[in-house]
């Protein structure tokens, strides 16, 4: 019951994450122009990574397309390349995890292969929320760079003003979604992983059987027909090998390694 | 690149009219942002207007608000500016300027600029 809660948990925190993830790659406020010790102007600019957008005091906004791809900062290429990586194996976890939850019966799948599947899935999900944490993080940095860049290049104007010669930008609401959703993508991927080993089907699965002897004491060796006592042939020594250990087991046994020795 | 071309500059009387035009040679033209700056001996370069890509959003310095008007022909490549009521504080040399991603008052945001035109106002 609990592997199923927590294998169901971690699906739906991890289908939360990928979609945070995805809203996340298609918002357009990634950088959003720092007001502060700014000019009053009737505009504010905005970009994400597919496109720059420009809003108006009335509320009107125009945005428009990076269209150029050569023309774009390898780093946003870096990170454009890491959010997607991040969708598409969050995506084809999210397919894997389906078919992996125990609570829906497909066919006559074993619960081993439901346990690697759930593991596959939980290990997509945590390279997936790792690839969006680091896409939003390296956005970031770059941001933060640029933003104390553009404070050093400081100028005295005349009368002894200072202002900024380039706009600065600071961290969008985007970027918060995705180390959020990045988050819950990585969350989700761990209570996977430690719902796979509580799928997985025990390396030995035998109960425990004493054997009594009636009269003399017996010592049995897996050696053939053996059960010596230290007198020749003893009938209910073999009597006791041969019928004495019935378990519920033998009904349905698992095979181990022992089986084959 | 793009390289930018004032023209239209001129002596003209106070309360006089001009008509800038700045002539890009990118045909990429309606995928930037423009902008006029100008600069009067002795000062720095400041921020006359700028519009956007299609032209749906115009900003303008608080100095020739209502009195000056940015438009752009992108089929035409050039963005002009209207200059009506000039007044003798307006006299300098005008400057077309290019830039991708943003509509701001600042000169470091704009990637491309012209050679300029000069302006005069007599009074």
């Known amino acids: 019951m609990a592997v199923t809660a927590c294998q169901g948990l971690g699906f739906v925190v991890s289908l939360i994450g990928i979609a945070g993830i995805i809203a996340a790659t298609c918002m357009d406020q990634w950088s959003t122009q720092d007001l502060y010790n700014n000019p009053v102007t009737a505009v504010f600019n905005y970009q994400g990574l597919w496109r720059s957008c420009v809003r108006e005091s009335s509320g009107f906004t125009e945005c428009r397309g990076y269209f150029t791809l050569l023309g774009l900062p390898a780093m946003l290429q870096a990170v454009r390349a890491l959010m997607i990586v991040g969708i598409v194996l969050g995506a084809i976890g999210l397919l894997v995890s389906i078919f992996a939850l125990k609570c829906i019966r497909i066919g006559s799948m074993e619960d081993s292969a439901k346990a690697n599947m759930t593991l596959t899935s939980g290990i997509m999900f945590i390279v997936s929320g790792l690839c969006a944490i680091a896409g939003v993080s390296v956005f970031a940095n770059m941001l933060v760079t640029n933003f104390w860049m553009s404070t050093a290049n400081m100028y005295t104007g005349m009368g002894g003003m200072v202002q900024t010669v380039q706009t600065r930008y600071t961290f969008g609401a985007a970027l918060f979604v995705g180390w959020v959703a990045g988050g819950l993508t990585l969350i989700g991927g761990v209570m996977m992983c430690i719902a796979c080993r509580g799928l997985a089907p025990e390396e030995t699965n035998y109960k425990a059987v004493s054997y009594h002897a009636s009269g003399h004491s017996v010592a049995y060796k897996p050696g053939g027909f053996k059960a010596s006592t230290g007198f020749g042939s003893n009938t209910k020594n073999k009597k006791i090998y041969d019928g004495g250990a019935r378990t519920e087991d033998e009904v349905q046994s698992y095979p181990s390694k022992h089986d084959y020795v | 690149q793009v390289q930018l071309v004032e023209s239209g500059g001129g002596l003209v009387q106070t309360g006089g009219s001009l008509r800038l035009s700045c002539a890009a040679s990118?045909?990429?033209?309606?995928?930037?942002?423009m902008g006029w700056f100008r600069q009067a001996p002795g000062k720095e370069r400041e921020f006359v207007a700028g519009?956007?890509?299609?032209?749906?959003?115009?900003d303008y310095a608080d100095s020739v608000k209502g009195r000056f008007t940015i438009a752009r022909d992108n089929a035409k490549n050039t963005v002009y500016l209207q200059m009506n009521s000039l007044k003798p504080e307006d006299a300098a040399i005008y400057y077309c300027a290019a830039n991708a991603i943003q509509l701001t008052r600042r000169s470091g945001d704009y990637a491309y600029w012209g050679q300029g035109t000069q302006v005069t106002v007599s009074s």
């Open positions: 519009i956007t890509w299609s032209g749906g959003i115009k």
């Open positions: 990118d045909s990429t033209f309606s995928s930037y942002i």
